[in-house]
């Protein structure tokens, strides 16, 4: 029998990239009957929430107002049932954006290419930064990193219709503080007709799957099974 509770799932509501001075919302999904959830930031306690009533709710939301570089970093959460704590969730990287300047994104040979052509994106930012990030809208977890003093290049290799979509880039002042996003560049890949149906237009920011899936029990639980989730010795 287990002596630990399942680890919770931590998510960012809407997006993990939060413009400065805006509110971030993180969700911690644990178990029905959990008494308390703790949000930890860089290993230290950051916030506590208690679901009301605990037996009807399987998680909580943590609101982080006025986002800034001091609040950007690695978050995790834990919860307890009775006095037993769960394992820690996986780490979530929360990024603050709209810091300082706006980079320029361009694509070579151009925004309209044929399937199989080699494509390179260029991200340029004149202020002091060495890391650049390229994101495809709707795929914001798939961040490509590249390094350069003022400009970085992102070679894509031979493209397919799966590469179609809007791209933005950021300059990064550290792992968790990013510039304003560039204006989007829409890559249109023609040809390769038989694969076209496999590459629908991507959703725009924020990622549609990057949401909080907290649920509320409608009926009263007939027992407190969760209290007996763990062995007593």
């Amino acid at each position: 029998p287990k002596q630990t509770l399942p680890k919770p799932i931590i998510r960012a509501e809407s997006t993990y990239m939060v413009p400065k001075e805006k509110q971030a919302t993180l969700c911690c999904q644990g178990s029905y009957g959990a008494v308390e959830y703790q949000l930890h930031f860089e290993g230290s306690l950051f916030a506590v929430e208690r679901p009301k009533p605990p037996e009807r709710i399987n998680g909580v939301k943590f609101h982080i107002p006025d986002m800034n570089s001091r609040k950007a970093g690695r978050y995790s959460c834990i919860y307890r049932v009775g006095e037993l704590w769960s394992e820690r969730s996986d780490l979530l990287d929360l990024v603050v954006t709209e810091m300082y300047d706006t980079p320029t994104l361009s694509v070579h040979p151009g925004p309209e290419v044929t399937s199989g052509e080699k494509v390179t994106f260029y991200c340029r930012l004149d202020t002091a930064t060495s890391m650049f990030l390229l994101l495809k809208e709707g795929r914001s977890r798939d961040v490509q990193r590249s390094y350069g003093k003022v400009q970085a290049e992102f070679p894509m290799g031979p493209v397919t219709t799966a590469h179609r979509g809007s791209y933005r880039c950021f300059g990064s002042y550290n792992n968790y503080a990013w510039s304003f996003p560039s204006e989007p560049v829409k890559l249109l890949v023609t040809g390769d007709i038989e694969n076209t149906s496999l590459a629908p237009t991507d959703p725009t920011f924020p990622d549609s799957w990057d949401t909080c899936l907290l649920t509320r029990e409608t009926g009263l639980q007939k027992d407190l099974a969760l209290w007996d989730h763990t062995a007593q010795n």
Epitope: Q3, V48, P53, P54, G82, E83, R88, W227, H229
Partner: antibody, heavy 117, light 107 residues
Framework: QVQLVQSGAEVKKPGASVKVSCKAS????????MHWVRQAPGQGLEWIGY????????EYNQKFKDRTTLTADKSTSTAYMELSSLRSEDTAVYYC??????????WGQGTLVTVSS | DIQMTQSPSSLSASVGDRVTITCRAS??????LAWFQQKPGKAPKLLVY???NLADGVPSRFSGSGSGTDYTLTISSLQPEDFATYYC?????????FGGGTKVEIK
């Protein structure tokens, strides 16, 4: 079976520190929190705080936060509570208590700490 | 901090009596309440957790009830070994706090 065995009684002078140990056996030490509770003579129960031996994370009753340090040694399955700047009103029996999904399910036998000049 | 107010502070009863002890929290604790029994010179023993659940090995004459802010421990038929002090305790937030105790004495 689960056992929490505490160190013996202590007599201390005001201003001194005391460190009480609690050796756990019969379960996986790192899977459960260890709480500390005290009881002054003829009085009720007062929660001091807890430690998660797995992570070392601690949480304290604000009343004791400045004077109490909770630690745990995973290699010996032993939890410790150190109380500094002792005063006469700290005279009490100190208990270590395992925290489980059912709350405070196993208690140590208690350690009497007497503070007297 | 959540205050736990226990009543009565003491009571006298005879073997076979039905005994009821109440505990009131200063705010809703959502059934996150435990009851303990303590005999002189001994550590407390867990009787009830999550307001209504009997701990392992606790006789069925003990029962817990209540929700929100008001909770009750009932001993349906008092036995000689039940003369002791009883405490309620919440574990809804920090700090965990205990009621002041109810001493059950022989009439």
């Amino acid at each position: 079976q689960v056992q929490l065995v505490q160190s013996g009684a202590e007599v201390k002078k005001p201003g001194a520190s005391v460190k009480v140990s609690c050796k756990a056996s019969g379960y996986t030490f790192t899977s459960f929190t260890m709480h500390w509770v005290r009881q002054a003579p003829g009085q009720g129960l007062e929660w001091i705080g807890y430690i998660n031996p797995s992570s070392g994370y601690t949480e304290y009753n604000q009343k004791f936060k400045d004077r109490t340090t909770l630690t745990a040694d995973k290699s010996t399955s032993t939890a410790y509570m150190e109380l500094s700047s002792l005063r006469s009103e700290d005279t009490a029996v100190y208990y270590c208590v395992r925290g489980s999904s059912r709350g405070f399910d196993y208690w140590g036998q208690g350690t009497l700490v007497t503070v007297s000049s | 901090d959540i205050q736990m107010t226990q009543s009565p502070s003491s009571l006298s009863a005879s073997v076979g009596d039905r005994v009821t002890i109440t505990c009131r929290a200063s705010e809703n604790i959502y059934s996150n309440l435990a009851w303990f029994q303590q005999k002189p010179g001994k550590a407390p023993k867990l009787l009830v957790y999550a307001a209504t659940n009997l701990a392992d090995g606790v006789p069925s004459r003990f029962s817990g009830s209540g929700s929100g802010t008001d909770y009750t421990l009932t001993i349906s038929s008092l036995q000689p070994e039940d003369f002791a002090t009883y405490y309620c305790q919440h574990f809804w937030g920090t700090p965990r706090t205990f009621g002041g105790g109810t001493k059950v004495e022989i009439k």
